[in-house]
């Protein structure tokens, strides 16, 4: 946030940029979290966007029985390894089919008993707050669909009818690894020492990180007349004066006719 | 890249015999997978046999019995000695080959493809 400044006071204003602000030569240069000609005012509200998707990463090992394992498999620039991987993703291409998260697979490592085929399943989803439960049912049917083709698709009489055989007991999930994103978190993070006065708010389920001072929000604090200024302790409304009233209270709901005041009398709305 | 020519199809009556060749070029036969498929008129295409380089034979329970798969490396082609013929055996026969060592008959595991030769059994 920048405000520029004219004139034979910005020399001066220079070196009284606040709050980390920075002088350009025109205007200081404020950090994230100020503004104003002196970088002296606190937003009132932080860009935490979210990241348009959250990933999610499935670690599986499943034994393929149906191709013998030789030792060029091991070498991902192989024809054998190159072939071997275009049939294992078509396969898991169809097992996950049902599943609108899966981005699809990555073999890690094809090692001997059979072929013991190490990879992850790759999930993906848009961010939404309830990410981590579209991400945990998902896991959970990749689990349930490689578990049932690895128990349906297997050999019989030595050989294959299928695009590809498993040994039913050589499915295993090693681990599963969601991006983790906590808005509440970045949000206190990025307040700094003003984080115990920003919180998260949704609005179209996505998150806002704002202080009272943020019109518009359940937490928004109300100045009236006044205008909402953030301080180390908490949000404060400074109230204004006009012609013909002083404001004063907590939220300058208090208005004295001045008129009075000189009159001696007070009068309260 | 793996090229596939099939040879030998024909008309034969019921009972006979017919020895279908393909010639392969590229070197899966030392290292991978060669087999062959058939696909009847109107009706998916199905494994038949398949022989890999560790010697290993497989075929379909339709063919057993009647049906030898073999290959000459020196000459780098497959050979299907077909006996004892049906009318239900006519098709056209497919010559497939993997860089793998597959034990699949699944149309869906093979990924080089000759363009087939025709079988008719028919009196």
């Known amino acids: 946030r920048t405000t520029t400044c004219f004139g034979d006071g910005c020399q001066n204003t220079a070196s009284r940029c606040k709050n980390g602000g920075t002088w350009d030569g025109l205007k200081c240069q404020c950090p994230n979290l100020y503004y104003g000609e002196l970088c002296e005012e606190v937003v009132s509200s932080i860009d935490i966007g979210p990241p348009e998707t959250i990933s999610a990463q499935m670690e599986l090992t499943v034994t393929v029985t149906s191709v013998k394992f030789t030792e060029e498999l091991k070498n991902h620039s192989s024809q054998e390894f190159q072939e071997f991987k275009q049939t294992f993703t078509e396969q898991m291409n169809i097992v996950y089919s049902g599943i609108p998260e899966y981005v699809g697979v990555n073999i890690t490592k094809l090692r001997l008993g059979s072929v013991v085929v190490e990879h992850d399943v790759l999930l993906r989803t848009k961010y939404t707050p309830e990410y981590k439960t579209v991400l945990d049912n998902a896991t959970e049917v990749v689990k349930e669909k490689i578990t049932k083709v690895t128990t349906q698709q297997i050999m019989i009489n030595d050989i294959c009818s299928d695009m590809m055989c498993f040994n039913t007991t050589g499915t295993q999930v090693q681990n599963i690894t969601v991006t983790q994103y906590d808005p509440e978190e970045d949000c206190r993070k990025m307040a700094k020492e003003y984080g115990d006065y920003f919180v998260v708010e949704y609005r179209d389920q996505k998150p806002y990180c704002i202080s009272p001072c943020e019109p518009g929000f359940s937490v928004s604090k109300n100045c009236n007349l006044g205008k909402c200024q953030m301080s180390l302790s908490g949000p404060q409304c400074l109230c204004v004066t006009t012609e013909t009233h002083w404001y004063s209270g907590e939220t300058c709901n208090q208005g004295t006719q001045k008129s009075l005041v000189y009159g001696h009398h007070h009068h309260h709305h | 890249e793996v090229q596939l020519v099939e040879s030998g199809g024909g008309l034969v009556q019921p009972g006979g015999s017919l020895r279908l060749s393909c010639a392969a070029s590229g070197n899966t036969f030392s290292r991978g997978s060669m087999s062959w498929f058939r696909q009847a008129p109107g009706k998916e295409r199905e494994g038949v046999a398949i022989i890999s380089s560790d010697g290993w034979t497989g075929y379909a329970d339709s063919v057993k019995g009647r049906f030898t798969i073999s290959q000459d490396n020196a000459k780098n082609s497959l050979y299907l000695q077909m006996n004892s013929l049906r009318a239900e055996d006519t098709a056209v026969y497919y010559c497939?080959?993997?860089?793998?060592?597959?034990?699949?008959?699944?149309?869906?595991?093979?990924?080089?493809w000759g363009q087939g030769t025709m079988v008719t059994v028919s009196s």
């Open positions: 497939a080959a993997s860089f793998l060592v597959l034990r699949a008959l699944n149309p869906k595991a093979w990924h080089y």
